[in-house]
């Protein structure tokens, strides 16, 4: 594959990454799969600057990101280290709340109205953001 040099149509470029912002909702796993099919991943927030960029584009709407603890510890989908990385949880979050009546706890992270993060039921259909890095090799064949 060739190195991607510009973002696909309808994606937004920012700091050598491309972002796609959904306008409807999906469960976390479906959103994750959607991004993977686009040769991307759910957004991984690594800095305050990136947080503000994403927040500006999504507006005050609950929106999935690529962070979950479905297998125990919190993990970013691209392997970025959670413990040492950027975090922006709401007060008292994550809390793995069981009181929602949907079954189980809360294992997936999302941006809330003010941009701070909350853990929620992964089955809830929220909007989502895909991200792919411009510098990574594309799966598309090179143009001849």
């Amino acid at each position: 594959g060739s190195e991607r040099t510009c973002c696909p149509v309808n994606w937004v470029e920012h700091e050598r990454s491309c972002y796609w912002f959904s306008r409807s909702g999906k469960a976390w796993a479906d959103a994750d799969n959607y991004c993977r099919l686009e040769d991307a991943h759910l957004v991984v927030v690594t800095s305050w600057e990136e947080q503000k960029f994403v927040q500006h584009h999504i507006g005050p709407v609950n929106t999935w990101m690529g962070l979950h603890d479905q297998n125990g510890p919190w993990k970013w989908v691209d392997g970025t280290d959670y413990e040492t990385g950027f975090k922006n949880w709401r007060p008292e979050q994550p809390d793995d709340w069981y009181g929602h009546g949907l079954g189980g706890g809360e294992d997936c992270a999302h941006f809330t109205d003010d941009g701070r993060w909350n853990d929620d039921v992964c089955q809830r259909p929220y909007r989502w953001v895909c991200e792919t890095e411009l510098d990574k090799a594309s799966q598309e064949p090179p143009l001849l």
């Epitope: 409807s24 479906d30 009181g99 909007r127």
Partner: antibody, heavy 121, light 112 residues
């Protein structure tokens, strides 16, 4: 404009079954969670069931669990409520209602006019 | 299940006068996302319910500004600053923080 039209109500004997339908138009049906809400004659509102936009998740109020099944056909823009083992206390006007947004919103902003189900021997 | 308790259950109001309805929930309706999942609906005679207020205090589109909602946690209030004849009907509060979603018993508002 958004329209929800329920049908399938009527008089049915206790223990029998009935299937309600709700035909949706004026919006992208497959993007929205849908609900059934009922109202017994002269009484208040009772939430009955919810189904996810894609049909993957369904939840019910305790009094109908195991008897009622909510389903949808996104190709037909139609919501259903299969009601089995009906009881006198299921007598009500049944409304279908649409979620407020095409993502989880926690409220209904559009309702149908309702269809009356009467369970009586 | 979360129990929603409305008071009063009926209200007779002179046109132009204010009205207030209280709704109390048996558990906090504040979610981890910072929203409070409390809603107000009005059901006019012979009609399905219509949304008035979402997330405690936000008026739904087309709802007159004489309607306002307030409260937090478990205690909520719907106020009508000046009641008009078209405001008659039954007002319901509803919570959706927990399945099953539950409604208050309803408050019937009539004009004196």
């Amino acid at each position: 404009q958004v329209q929800l039209v329920e049908s399938g109500g009527g008089v049915v004997q206790p223990g029998r079954s009935l299937r309600l339908s709700c035909a949706a138009s004026g919006f992208t049906f497959s993007n929205y969670g849908m609900h059934w809400v009922r109202q017994a004659p002269g009484k208040g509102l009772e939430w009955v069931a919810i189904i996810w936009y894609d049909g993957t998740n369904k939840y019910y109020t305790d009094s109908v669990k195991g008897r009622f099944t909510i389903s949808r056909d996104n190709s037909k823009n139609t919501l259903y409520l299969q009601m089995n083992s009906l009881r006198a206390e299921d007598t009500a006007v049944y409304y279908c209602a649409r979620e407020g947004h095409d993502f989880w919103s926690g409220f209904f902003c559009y309702w149908g006019q309702g269809t009356l189900v009467t369970v009586s021997s | 299940d979360i129990v929603m308790t409305q008071t009063p259950l009926s209200l007779s109001v002179t046109p132009g006068q204010p009205a207030s309805i209280s709704c109390k929930s048996s558990q906090s309706l504040l979610h981890g996302d910072g929203k409070t999942y409390l809603y107000w609906y009005l059901q006019k005679p012979g009609q399905p319910p219509q949304l008035l207020i979402y997330e405690v205090s936000n008026r739904f589109s087309g709802v007159p500004d004489r309607f306002s909602g307030s409260g937090s946690g478990t205690d909520f209030t719907l106020k009508i600053s000046r009641v008009e004849a078209e405001d008659v009907g039954v007002y319901y509060c509803m919570q959706s923080i927990q399945i099953p979603w539950t409604f208050g018993q309803g408050t019937k508002v009539e004009i004196k």
